[in-house]
Interface confidence: medium
């Protein structure tokens, strides 16, 4: 199937991922606190159409501040 | 045995152009994302740019935005990084590294930027 | 924006043991893999330590690392003059400022 360049989809955006969220993990869909119900998970923004560093980093799970 | 070569490295006044290549051998090329990192004579590393597996993702440090370009071709297991508006600061060796974790690193090519 | 800082040098006779830390400044360093470099004078940096603490293939076992609160840290025992280099660790893109090691004598 056609896919845009720039768009990343299964083994490929998890391993992206992995990279840009600097092994500390990730969400597929964000955390509800920052995204209402009819808001777009990660594999229909990325994989669908393209993204970028900065909106892959939205995914990226929130590490925890030194106390 | 993995092994990585970059080549493409030499001398360019400001603002010209360079393009590196990386060709791999070693490993199934095309299972693993890959980078450019650089060092600045003296200096430690700095990481420059990535590229996914299949070559669909592409990130770059704020430093060369807009500059430089990452490329790949998975039927010649060669990884390219195109550099244009060469600054003074761009001076480095630069190296290609393998996978996310960078568990293989080539020799280096040296980049020399200065009139 | 993360900062992983580093000692700038560090240096032990032959046959001691080492450390070198790698503290993180921006956010906690616990909830990221962090992965150690060893460069000889003169050659491409070399993976040391992946995932905090595991060792690649043909890493001898006189080098280990660990992980705590907002610090990692790498090891080095049994020093030798071949590990006259320098470290660096890192979190994926970020790499620590680098440490030289130095061996005494």
């Known amino acids: 199937a056609y896919r845009p360049s720039e768009t990343l989809c299964g083994g490929e955006l998890v391993d992206t991922l992995q990279f840009v969220c600097s092994d500390r993990g990730f969400y597929f869909s964000r955390p509800s606190s920052r995204a209402n119900r009819r808001s777009r998970g990660i594999v229909e923004e990325c994989c669908f159409r393209s993204c970028d560093l900065a909106l892959l980093e939205t995914y990226c799970a929130t590490p925890a501040k030194s106390e | 045995q993995v092994e990585l070569v970059e080549s493409g490295g030499g001398l360019v006044q400001p603002g010209g152009s360079l393009r590196l290549s990386c060709a791999a051998s070693g490993f199934t090329w095309s299972s693993f994302a890959m980078s450019w990192v650089r060092q600045a004579p003296g200096k430690g590393l700095e990481w420059v740019s990535y590229?996914?597996?299949?070559?669909?993702?592409?990130g770059y440090a704020d430093s060369v935005k807009g500059r430089f370009t990452i490329s790949r071709d998975n039927s010649k297991n060669t990884l390219y990084l195109q550099m244009n508006s060469l600054r003074a600061e761009d001076t480095a060796v630069y190296y290609c590294a393998r996978g996310t974790k960078f568990d293989y690193w080539g020799q280096g090519t040296l980049v020399t930027v200065s009139s | 924006d993360i900062v992983l800082t580093q000692p700038p040098s560090v240096s032990g006779a032959p046959g001691q043991r080492v450390t070198i830390s790698c503290t993180g400044s921006s956010s906690n360093i616990g909830t990221y893999d962090v992965h150690w470099y060893q460069q000889l004078p003169g050659t491409a940096p070399k993976l040391l330590i992946y995932?905090?603490?595991k060792r690649p293939s043909g890493v001898p076992d006189r080098f280990s690392g660990s992980k705590s609160g907002t610090s990692a840290s790498l090891a080095i025992t049994g020093l030798q003059s071949e590990d006259e280099a320098d470290y660096y660790c890192s979190i994926t893109r970020v790499f620590g400022g680098g440490t030289k090691l130095t061996v005494l004598g």
């Open positions: 590229i996914s597996y299949l070559g669909s993702y592409t």
């Open positions: 995932s905090n603490s």
